[in-house]
């Protein structure tokens, strides 16, 4: 589910194994499958589960990626 063409999935067990613009998660719908890969970070106003999912300069607040200099997503 990367936006970059010909992206080679990199297997991972935790976010620290991925690049600064990536996080570690299952690419399958519902996230039920066991295999995890490095996925492109989530931009502002996207759903998130944890800070590492959000792109640099953003963090996960109440399930939404928000800018680090903002208090809310709206």
């Amino acid at each position: 589910y990367q936006t970059i063409d010909n992206y080679q999935p990199y297997p991972c067990a935790e976010d620290e194994e991925c690049g600064t613009d990536e996080y570690c998660a299952s690419p399958t719908r519902g996230g039920d499958a066991g295999v995890q890969i490095c996925l492109a970070c989530r931009k502002r106003r996207k759903r998130c589960m944890r800070h590492a999912m959000c792109c640099p300069g953003n963090y996960c607040k109440n399930g939404i990626c928000v800018s680090s200099d903002q208090n809310h997503f709206r």
């Epitope: 936006t3 519902g30 106003r45 109440n62």
Partner: antibody, heavy 119, light 107 residues
């Protein structure tokens, strides 16, 4: 099988509140978001907001801020949507729908609950 | 917020025809677009996700394409059971937005 079953039709007076339930079965309730979408007769689909049943986090469309509350009871795998200060324009069919947190799509929908607001 | 504009708002076609519906986003949404079918009195049904991926169990005559701001939904050969209203929906970011719908009728 995977399904969402909603509560029955409601008739309410203007100014009242309505609480619609959505019971999930056939999958792990806390693994998917629940979204609420409404549709007035002959009109299009209108997104109201989302709820993460795992954390209880919610996000509401600006139009409904302050009037809508989305909650859940994980022990009975049920999501709830309460809309207050009802007016005639809130007369619609209200749907719950499942998505994962990537918003790949609302792949499972409830059957809909008709809410009629009339004096 | 992102606005989604669908066209046409309604169309009439014959069985076997190729039918095309377009959806335009007010800003770039990459491929974060879904298509739904809704038959009268029923809940919507997800047909296409991520702009071009066919949902499980959906007939292959349905397809989607596009990215950025312009998207297309196609029925390669219209069947009588396809009569419904079709909606696009963006999920690039919150708030979620649906197109106004395209009502499809049989000629």
């Amino acid at each position: 099988q995977v399904q969402l079953v909603q509560s029955g039709a409601e008739v309410k007076k203007p100014g009242a509140s309505v609480k619609v339930s959505c019971k999930a079965s056939g999958y792990t309730f806390t693994s998917y978001d629940i979204n609420w979408v409404r549709q007035a007769t002959g009109q299009g689909l209108e997104w109201m907001g989302w709820m993460d049943p795992n954390s209880g986090n919610t996000g509401y469309a600006q139009k409904f801020q302050g009037r809508v509350t989305m909650t859940r009871n994980t022990s009975i795998s049920t999501a709830f949507m309460e809309l207050s200060s009802l007016r005639s324009e809130d007369t619609a069919v209200y749907y719950c729908a499942r998505t994962d947190y990537f918003y790949f799509g609302m792949d499972v929908w409830g059957q809909g609950t008709t809410v009629t607001v009339s004096s | 917020d992102i606005q989604m504009t669908q066209s046409p708002s309604s169309l009439s076609a014959s069985v076997g025809d190729r039918v095309t519906i377009t959806c335009q986003a007010s800003q770039d949404i990459s491929k974060d677009l879904n298509w739904y079918q809704q038959k009268p009195g029923k809940a919507p049904r997800l047909l296409i996700y991520d702009a071009s991926n066919l949902e499980t169990g959906v007939p292959s005559r349905f397809s989607g394409s596009g990215s950025g701001t312009d998207f297309t939904f196609t029925i390669s050969s219209l069947q009588p059971e396809d009569i419904a209203t079709f909606y696009c929906q963006q999920y690039d970011h919150l708030p979620i937005a649906f197109g106004q719908g395209t009502r499809l009728e049989i000629k």
